[in-house]
């Protein structure tokens, strides 16, 4: 176990021409915050894919108001580090996404508005316990300068945080074959408890006799690289030569969860859901009371005053599990109505609404027909958050306020001349044609292709189209 730490040094315009406009203004003050998402391995996954190694959100930075006419300076940053705790081994290779978000503080409907200013991503190799690594990334005209490191949480040490340290049993030296734990010289490496032969680089253990593999390695001793060549079956170690994955024991086989815990497979390992009164990676810790602080993520512990009585964790919104250890994937509930796009910022849920919809969850269908009349006898037709006017004859435009030119579409056939009329249009037909749109030829003998023209109307006379 350990913590990935990210320190943002600056965020501002990059070098070169085309400096970006300040994201804040006197009319619309704003402040920045950052989100980091970590994924194991050198994956090139979509930004929306899960942050399997973890994610963190910074505090909000100071409120910033642009000075009129001044170019965008480096913007004021939030205090402190972004910390992403990891429970298992540090994978050594990882992908990151760092997002810079703007929170607008103007008094707009819907509360503070968040918008993504910049997103940078990269793939890096990093050993835990090493020094801070410095980086500069550019996103469009913006430049982000930052440092990062991974450090192990005691008692773990090593480049993957898989070796354990224990206080010295003797004041002067460590036991046979055991080295001091740098930088904790007063502690010694714990005796090796992994399965004999387990790769020190690619394997680790949390229980005596086991050998669990880091991503990209397989085999009973984690010495076989996983092949990317096609395999017939999806899981488990195969021959030690190819490293191809074929069916084998899954991480939940034999149920590693003690005390009635239920096991579920995760992309990299397994996870135990423990019954009340037990916790730990394998539900192995028991006799827990509220005094032990078993509720994570700000959960409220109730009951459990002594080890024999169960405690109950009342989880804060966004967390679940008997110890509030699991984050609820709020976007999986598809909370954004009417085709809105969901974004879980950690501290809040945001929906990006399709045109025609508004509200925190895109629940507000912008019904433009309400209180909006179509002029000149037109009727309003709603649909999908938009509206249109179906105009009466002779009128057009968005609100039927414009007089339509009925002749614009050249409605008179066979060279007939069109005349606009208050009730529509009139066609004056060329010789040899008749009908409201001059659509019927007049036969040489004077008969038409239709029944005779109405009394009093000679072929060639203008016909009014009503």
């Amino acid at each position: 176990a350990g913590v990935f730490e990210l320190q943002i040094h600056s965020f501002g315009p990059g070098p070169g021409p085309g400096a970006p406009r300040s994201p804040c203004s006197a009319r619309l003050p704003c402040r920045l915050f950052f989100r980091v998402c970590l994924k194991p391995g050198l994956s090139e996954e979509a930004a929306e894919s899960p942050c399997a190694l973890g994610a963190a959100l910074s505090a909000r930075g100071p409120v910033y108001t642009e000075q009129p006419g001044a170019p965008a300076p480096d913007l004021p940053l939030p205090d402190g580090l972004l910390q992403v705790p990891f429970r298992d081994a540090w994978p050594g290779t990882f992908s990151f996404i760092i997002e810079t978000w703007r929170e607008e503080l103007g008094d707009q409907i819907g509360g503070p508005a968040w918008s993504l200013l910049a997103r940078v991503a990269g793939r890096r190799r990093l050993a835990a316990g090493g020094p801070w690594a410095r980086d500069i990334q550019r996103a469009g005209a913006w430049e982000l300068r930052f440092s990062y490191r991974a450090r192990c949480e005691p008692p773990a040490v090593g480049t993957a945080c898989t070796r354990l340290c224990r206080p010295r049993s003797a004041p002067s030296r460590c036991g046979p074959g055991l080295r001091p734990c740098a930088p904790l010289e007063d502690e010694c490496e714990a005796p090796l408890v992994c399965r004999a032969g387990c790769s020190p680089e690619h394997g680790f253990c949390e229980q005596p006799g086991e050998c669990r593999c880091l991503e990209g390695w397989t085999g009973p001793l984690c010495t076989v690289p996983v092949s990317t060549s096609s395999c017939l079956s999806p899981r488990g170690p195969s021959s030690a030569t190819t490293g191809c994955l074929v069916p084998g024991p899954g991480p939940c086989d034999g149920n590693p969860c003690a005390n009635g815990g239920s096991c579920s497979e995760t992309p990299r390992s397994f996870e135990c859901t423990c019954p009340r009164g037990f916790y730990g990676l394998r539900c192995e810790v028991s006799g827990v009371t509220c005094a032990d602080g078993p509720c994570f993520n700000g959960g409220l512990c109730v009951g459990g005053a002594d080890p024999d009585s169960a405690y109950i964790c009342h989880c804060p919104p966004g967390f679940q599990g008997s110890n509030c250890e699991k984050r609820v994937d709020r976007c999986s509930l598809q909370p954004c109505r009417n085709g809105g796009l969901c974004l879980d910022l950690g501290h809040a849920l945001r929906c990006r609404c399709r045109a025609g919809f508004a509200g925190p969850r895109c629940e507000h269908d912008l019904d433009d027909c309400a209180g909006r009349a179509c002029a000149n006898g037109g009727t309003c037709v709603e649909g999908g958050g938009a509206h249109r006017c179906s105009c009466a004859l002779g009128f057009g435009g968005r609100d039927c306020r414009e007089r339509a030119d009925p002749c614009a579409a050249r409605p008179c056939a066979h060279g007939g001349r069109c005349y606009a009329h208050f009730s529509g249009l009139v066609c004056a037909c060329a010789p040899g044609y008749m009908g409201a749109r001059c659509e019927f030829p007049v036969h040489p003998d004077g008969a038409s292709a239709l029944p005779a023209a109405p009394p009093g109307l000679r072929p060639g006379d203008p016909q009014r189209y009503l």
């Epitope: 409907i109 819907g110 919104p317 966004g318 598809q334 109505r337 809040a348 849920l349 925190p360 269908d365």
Partner: antibody, heavy 121, light 107 residues
Framework: EVQLVESGGGLVKPGGSLKLSCAAS????????IHWVRQAPEKGLEWVAY????????YYADTVKGRFTISRDNAKNTLFLQMTSLRSEDTAMYYC??????????????WGQGTSVTVSS | DIQMTQTTSSLSASLGDRVTISCRAS??????LNWYQQKPDGTVKLLIY???RLHSGVPSRFSGSGSGTDYSLTISNLDQEDIATYFC?????????FGGGTKLDIK
């Protein structure tokens, strides 16, 4: 325990005004949106108005738009409904109800016991 | 506005019966459907949200199902304390609308 207690109801003449209050306890008031819902005698439930946790988002039913104003005081854990230009059809039991956290479902998960409003000359 | 229709306005059943109350929306509400119970004294409680999720403290004999425009509330083993009026409510699009209610009593 989540508790919502409405007050301020009573008898008022048509065209008159009334201000309802809803006192909240047992939860972090400023984390939740709150609704007003009413029920006319022998009728069903009718949603009236909603205000988001920070007071930024406010919605009204068309039947009360322009006459009713919803507001909240997070420091005092209190919700208000200012009703003006009252009509006989506004006669109902008025309930305040807590919205769900994050407004994912737009549920009303806890309700008060209601306060009665009668509009009559 | 989305209209919510509860076709059965009243229903009589015996203790221990399985009772189903239906609710229809005038258009797809994408499972944002909640059920409430109103006791004769006026007390209102949320039973089920998002079509099928049981609100905390609600007995497991209550269940919900449905999708699109058609939804139902089922009480699997009718108890005396279930005598009440049941309302559905859509939380998909403003304004939030309720069904007319189904009054349940004991035969």
């Amino acid at each position: 325990e989540v508790q919502l207690v409405e007050s301020g109801g009573g008898l008022v003449k048509p065209g008159g005004s009334l201000k309802l209050s809803c006192a909240a306890s047992g939860f972090t008031f400023s984390d939740y949106g709150i609704h007003w819902v009413r029920q006319a005698p022998e009728k069903g439930l009718e949603w009236v108005a909603y205000i988001s946790s920070g007071g930024y988002t406010i919605y009204y039913a068309d039947t009360v738009k322009g006459r009713f104003t919803i507001s909240r005081d997070n420091a005092k854990n209190t919700l208000f409904l200012q009703m003006t230009s009252l009509r006989s059809e506004d006669t109902a039991m008025y309930y305040c109800a807590r919205g769900d956290y994050d407004d994912i479902f737009y549920t009303m998960d806890y309700w008060g016991q209601g306060t009665s409003v009668t509009v009559s000359s | 506005d989305i209209q919510m229709t509860q076709t059965t306005s009243s229903l009589s059943a015996s203790l221990g019966d399985r009772v189903t109350i239906s609710c229809r929306a005038s258009r797809d509400i994408t499972k944002f459907l909640n059920w409430y119970q109103q006791k004769p004294d006026g007390t209102v409680k949320l039973l089920i949200y998002y079509t099928s999720r049981l609100h905390s403290g609600v007995p497991s004999r209550f269940s919900g199902s449905g999708s699109g425009t058609d939804y139902s509330l089922t009480i699997s083993n009718l108890d005396q304390e279930d005598i009440a009026t049941y309302f559905c409510q859509q939380g998909n699009t403003l304004p939030w609308t309720f069904g007319g209610g189904t009054k349940l009593d004991i035969k």
